[in-house]
């Protein structure tokens, strides 16, 4: 094959080699860029900057080598368009530093930086950590800082990510209230900060205020949907990024739904309860408190992480005709109480009424208008009702 006269020549089926001295000063308009998986660049003294636009369109790139060139600066977002990049060799350039953001989001198996005049500072703390943790083949390179000795020996006591404190209201928050959150950011070399509110959707009207080092966030006219939703404050400096998430508890009264009994490995009376704080529960059977046992008990499904509603079953493991009747679920919290009832028929009575038939659970009369009793049970007494805290 005739030698390739161009600045960059194909190499294998999806590679490109650019090795002709001084032929490139940027990576725009590389031939066949969209299919490239490997790009090898050498001896390009005029290639000094690597920026976001340079690698646009190189979405399939896996291996990037830029060696023995004049690279002085790699933008923090330079590899945004190359998410599949796994090997990055930038050895023997003029790099003094490389931001942690540059490699964030990449799954680099190999990162080669030897032969650069690195300047030891907190901005390279992330690289020092890679060396300590044996990542990306960094330890084998024995990286040196120009005139300062090994990177491994760089003092790092003062190299911390920002410290965040989010203040949330102490008082109870009710539906319709406005809530002010404040995020205090401390640390050296603060660069950026902000709020992540992706979970909030229709839970409140959002207004941001202030800037570093104190960010304000007003959540206006909050709804009960705000419960269990993360509000996240973030901040970055040259060392890295910190995030702190908080949740605002919006009080609302208990509510309850009951559904028709279903046979599910024995029987289940399905229910849903909601409320903040989580309501305590009591079951009644034909108007009397139903004391739970290993054969009739409340079982909750795994809760969803981002909602207050709990779903579950009253489990009846071996119900017979004596369990037929009216089941009522009482739910109560400090903001209100609710109840729902359902008739359940598990089995026809195979006998004439026999007054000696056992009642399979303990009952005690209850005033159905009363609020839930104390949910704490003394372990050495047989309680006269069951209260189950939800949430």
């Amino acid at each position: 094959a005739a030698p390739c006269p161009d600045a960059c020549c194909p190499h294998g089926s999806s590679g490109l080699r650019c090795t002709r001295d001084g032929a490139l000063d940027s990576l725009h308009h590389l031939p066949g860029a969209e299919n490239l998986t490997e790009l090898y660049i050498e001896n390009q003294q005029h290639l000094q900057h690597l920026e976001l636009r340079d690698l646009r369109g190189l979405g399939e790139l896996r291996n990037l080598t830029i060696v023995k060139s004049g690279l002085r600066f790699v933008a923090p977002d330079a590899f945004h368009f190359t998410p599949r990049l796994s090997r990055l060799n930038l050895s023997f350039n003029a790099l003094e530093s490389l931001s942690w953001k540059t490699v964030q989001g990449l799954s680099l198996q190999e990162l080669v930086l030897s032969g650069n005049p690195l300047h030891c500072s907190c901005a390279l703390r992330w690289l020092q950590r890679w060396e300590e943790e044996g990542l990306g083949g960094v330890p084998e390179q024995k990286l040196q800082c120009h005139g300062q000795g090994p990177l491994a020996h760089m003092p790092n006591a003062s190299c911390g990510v920002p410290t965040l404190k989010v203040q949330v209201p102490n008082a109870s928050v009710d539906v319709g209230d406005d809530v002010l959150l404040r995020c205090q950011v401390e640390g050296r070399g603060l660069e950026q900060a902000g709020w992540i509110l992706t979970e909030l959707e229709q839970s409140a009207t959002v207004m941001k205020s202030g800037g570093l080092p104190s960010l304000g966030l007003t959540l206006a006219n909050v709804t009960s949907d705000l419960n269990r939703k993360n509000v996240t404050c973030w901040a970055e400096n040259d060392v890295g990024r910190a995030e702190v998430s908080v949740q605002v508890n919006v009080s609302f009264p208990a509510s309850v739904q009951l559904h028709t009994a279903v046979e599910m490995h024995h029987w289940c009376i399905p229910f849903s309860v909601d409320g903040q704080p989580a309501p305590s529960l009591r079951w009644l059977f034909n108007g009397s408190v139903l004391n739970e046992t290993s054969f009739i008990f409340t079982e909750f499904l795994e809760p969803a992480a981002n909602e207050t509603v709990r779903h579950g079953c009253l489990r009846l493991n071996q119900p017979t005709h004596v369990n037929n009747g009216n089941y009522t679920l009482l739910a109560a919290n400090p903001f209100g109480q609710a109840s729902a009832s359902i008739m359940a028929a598990f089995m026809d009575n195979p006998f004439e009424f026999n007054p000696e038939d056992p009642i399979p659970v303990s009952f005690s009369p209850v005033d159905t208008n009363s609020t839930s009793g104390d949910p704490v049970e003394k372990k050495d007494e047989t309680p006269f009702g069951v209260s189950v805290a939800v949430g």
């Epitope: 024995h266 054969f295 008990f297 071996q318 119900p319 017979t320 004596v322 000696e356 056992p358 659970v361």
Partner: antibody, heavy 117, light 106 residues
Framework: QVQLVQSGAEVKKPGASVKVSCKSS????????MHWVRQAPGQGLEWMGE????????NYNEKFKNRVTMTVDISISTAYMELSRLRSDDTAVYYC??????????WGQGTTVTVSS | QVQLTQSPSSLSASVGDRVTITCSAS?????MHWYQQKPGKAPKRLIY???KLASGVPSRFSGSGSGTDYTLTISSLQPEDFATYFC?????????FGQGTRLEIK
């Protein structure tokens, strides 16, 4: 696989207390009731009570109600049965057994408690 | 409390025999459960919900009954079946067991 491993044999004096443990593995501890059953030498099985680790709910056999305490430590998936004011007729093998939708599907190996002066 | 009475209290039989053990409840229970226990071992669940075989239990074991009268049947005794058998109710607190039936080799 499911395992219920009980603590070792105990010898106690009349009037003392004994606390037997039952460590669970191989399943979600909080989803199952734990029962305690005892068997005196050459005798039948006697149910002492049950506890639901999910919420600490307990039901005791009236016969033992004033002497037995059942507790759980969810962090180590362990149930405990403490019997106080021991008498010689409390000499027995004490078993733990778990149930969810079906009765006592798995049992511990048993703990021998001897009450003797 | 519901009292369970097993009969017989003990019985001698030979390998290959058909054996029936009954359990009578002092009042109606919805289901009956059966356990097998060998000397020095914990009880093992045999039959639950009156007639369902626990996993790993051979099909020669069967259960039946309703109301107050329940039966455990072993259709053809095997050497490993010589043990003590207990019935149990799980319908009312306190849970109760029968006094046991000891099955011995004739």
């Amino acid at each position: 696989q499911v395992q219920l491993v009980q603590s070792g044999a105990e010898v106690k004096k009349p009037g003392a207390s004994v606390k037997v443990s039952c460590k669970s593995s191989g399943y979600t501890f909080t989803n199952y009731w734990m029962h305690w059953v005892r068997q005196a030498p050459g005798q039948g099985l006697e149910w002492m009570g049950e506890i639901y680790p999910n919420n600490g709910r307990v039901n005791y056999n009236e016969k033992f109600k004033n002497r037995v305490t059942m507790t759980v430590d969810i962090s180590i998936s362990t149930a405990y049965m403490e019997l106080s004011r021991l008498r010689s007729d409390d000499t027995a093998v004490y078993y733990c057994a778990r149930s969810r939708y079906d009765p006592m599907e798995d049992w511990g190996q048993g703990t021998t408690v001897t009450v003797s002066s | 409390q519901v009292q369970l009475t097993q009969s017989p209290s003990s019985l001698s039989a030979s390998v290959g025999d058909r054996v029936t053990i009954t359990c009578s409840a002092s009042s109606s229970v919805g289901y009956m459960h059966w356990y097998q226990q060998k000397p020095g071992k914990a009880p093992k669940r045999l039959i639950y919900d009156t007639s369902k075989l626990a996993s790993g239990v051979p099909s020669r074991f069967s259960g039946s009954g309703s109301g107050t009268d329940y039966t455990l049947t072993i259709s053809s005794l095997q050497p490993e079946d010589f043990a003590t058998y207990f019935c149990q109710q799980w319908s009312s607190i306190p849970l109760t067991f029968g006094q046991g039936t000891r099955l011995e080799i004739k």
